[in-house]
């Protein structure tokens, strides 16, 4: 799978994580920081 950094318009898309662009799937993906979950890393869990 080809990946690259997200475009600058997606700054802020991942609330608590890193945004990755999955080129072949035409979608952005959030790699969440430890303790966060959700499509956009918006949920905190203990």
């Amino acid at each position: 799978v080809s990946i690259t950094k997200c475009n600058s318009d997606m700054n802020g898309y991942c609330l608590h994580g890193q945004c990755i662009y999955l080129v072949d799937m035409s979608q952005n993906y959030c790699r969440c920081e430890v303790g966060y979950t959700g499509v956009r890393c918006e949920h905190f869990y203990l």
Partner: antibody, heavy 116, light 106 residues
């Protein structure tokens, strides 16, 4: 399957406002950005602005700043685009477009006619 | 705002011809360009995103290339069903469409 269903055609008088809705099904708009694009008859595509429904943050094209308001109601999974002080040049098909979780998934379009 | 200059605005070519459309951005858009096809009365159809990634179901005669500020869209062998208007879209920093290229059969 995923859908963006827009409100029906509108006819408005110059100076009035119009509010177009865009209801999502099959996905949560909080996971996406919702963009708005318009196309006047026989003209090209024009990006108007977008909203992040999760945070409420909006970005607008300079040309429309102060005249367009994009909002979202996450409880009904619906985005809205309101354009005020309408003039004849605003006659166009208005599209909502999902981006983020996938690349650019379009609604069916809403024709807004501005005529006295 | 980033400006996208698309050329030509229209072209006429014969079936089987190679057709090339270019888009020039006012600044580096880091390959974040998409190409759309639009036929009369229809919503735009995405053909290519991230410069050269063909969408599922799109014929291989369509291709894209470029980097920095200069990008190219090519139809290797024009078919009658390719008659449409084509638009580039930069999506690196907000969004800007090119002015469109109307493709007709000679």
């Amino acid at each position: 399957q995923d859908q963006l269903v827009q409100s029906g055609a509108e006819v408005k008088k110059p100076g009035a406002s119009v509010k177009v809705s865009c209801k999502a099904s099959g996905f949560n708009i909080k996971d996406t950005y919702i963009q708005w694009v318009r196309q006047a008859p026989g003209q090209g595509l024009e990006w108007m602005g977008r909203i992040d429904p999760l945070t409420g943050q909006t970005k607008y094209q300079e040309k429309f700043e102060g005249r367009v308001t994009i909002t979202a109601d996450t409880s009904t999974n619906t985005a809205y685009m309101e354009l005020s002080s309408l003039r004849s040049e605003d006659t166009a098909v208005y599209y909502c477009v999902r981006s983020g979780t996938s690349f650019d998934f379009w609604g069916q379009g809403t024709l807004v006619t501005v005529s006295s | 705002d980033i400006q996208m200059t698309q050329s030509p605005s229209s072209l006429s070519a014969s079936v089987g011809d190679r057709v090339t459309i270019t888009c020039k951005a006012s600044q580096d858009i880091h390959k974040y360009i998409a190409w759309y096809q639009q036929k009369p009365g229809q919503a735009p159809r995405l053909l290519i995103q991230y410069t050269s990634t063909l969408q599922p179901g799109v014929p291989s005669r369509f291709s894209g290339s470029g980097s920095g500020t200069d990008y190219t869209f090519t139809i290797s062998s024009l078919q009658p069903e390719d008659i449409a208007t084509y638009y580039c879209l930069q999506y690196d920093n907000l969004r800007t469409f090119g002015g469109g290229t109307k493709v007709e059969i000679k």
